[in-house]
Interface confidence: medium
């Protein structure tokens, strides 16, 4: 099946990073600089994607990849095969038309991209609040009042470590 | 109609330097992404270098990197390669070649010369 397609088709034998040249008889070009064919049998190459402003190179282009960028620091990447860079902000910020822009109160953003997203209600799962919320970070929530026999701590400490080749005393 | 007439090649011993020439008509050179193809005897082309986005930037390829130099005069509308320092597998016959951007996104690209036969020998 491959020798007859090959003699139906000559394109057919052109490796990625050629190109098949129907003006001249249809040989095996290769593709000029910055372009690439990743596949065999290509008609043409294509031209490589240049990493320009924002975009920083993070792989050069070959004959037979194209190649890909990444974001200067800052910003960060955004969409399918880093399509868009994005302004990166502050934690407890988000990014708005206007710029970076504080969380509201009742909001926070533990990251540099994203937006502000609602502190976790606590009471909706009967619990209490025991770390309160910051711009940066959720509320921590203890256990509900229900779990708490008297005298209990709200917190478990945790269990002490125990070091190899040593029995509990 | 375009033409790409290139000069300047023949017999240099290893070591040695030579100077091409691509003369271009039916478009204008400085507009263009231009450079040299050659092909050595018995195998395919390969690029040897380029002038490219309207000569904001140059092409090598690794095998010729420091030794040759791409340029153009575009008064002359003319294309050159500056060879030095040439070893017996610089032997090819160098084409003038000329980048051709396709509507669909697709690159090939076109010599229509005769090409100039450079030989590397002692």
């Known amino acids: 099946f491959e020798r007859t397609r090959s003699l139906q088709d000559p394109c057919s034998n052109c490796p990625a990073g050629t190109f098949c040249d129907n003006n001249r008889n249809q040989i095996c070009s290769p593709c000029p600089p910055n372009s690439f064919s990743s596949a065999g049998g290509q008609r043409t190459c294509d031209i490589c994607r240049q990493c320009k402003g924002v975009f920083r190179t993070r792989k050069e282009c070959s004959s037979t990849s194209n190649a890909e960028c990444d974001c200067t620091p800052g910003f960060h990447c955004l969409g399918a095969g880093c399509s868009m860079c994005e302004q990166d902000c502050k934690q407890g910020q988000e990014l708005t038309k206007k710029g970076c822009k504080d969380c509201c109160f009742g909001t926070f953003n533990d990251q540099k991209r994203g937006i502000c997203r609602p502190w976790t209600n606590c009471s909706l799962d009967g619990k209490s609040v025991l770390v309160n919320g910051t711009k940066e970070r959720d509320v921590v929530c203890g256990p509900s009042p229900a779990d708490l026999s008297p005298g209990a701590s709200s917190v478990t400490p945790p269990a002490p470590a125990r070091e190899p080749g040593h029995s509990p005393q | 109609e375009v033409q790409l007439l290139e000069s300047g090649g023949g017999l240099v011993q290893p070591g040695g330097s030579l100077r091409l020439s691509c003369a271009a008509s039916?478009?204008?050179?400085?507009?263009?992404?231009v450079g040299w193809v050659r092909q050595a005897p018995g195998k395919g082309l390969e690029w040897v270098s380029a002038?490219?986005?309207?000569?904001?930037?140059?092409y090598y390829a690794e095998s010729v990197k420091g030794r040759f130099t791409i340029s153009r005069d575009n008064a002359k509308n003319t294309l050159y390669l500056q060879m030095s320092s040439l070893r017996a597998e610089d032997t090819a016959v160098y084409y003038c070649?000329?980048?051709?951007?396709?509507?669909?996104?697709?690159?090939?690209?076109?010599?229509r010369g005769q090409g100039t036969q450079v030989t590397v020998s002692s």
């Open positions: 039916g478009f204008t050179l400085s507009a263009e992404d």
């Open positions: 070649a000329r980048v051709v951007y396709h509507a669909g996104g697709g690159v090939t690209y076109d010599y």
């Open positions: 002038i490219l986005d309207s000569g904001g930037s140059t």
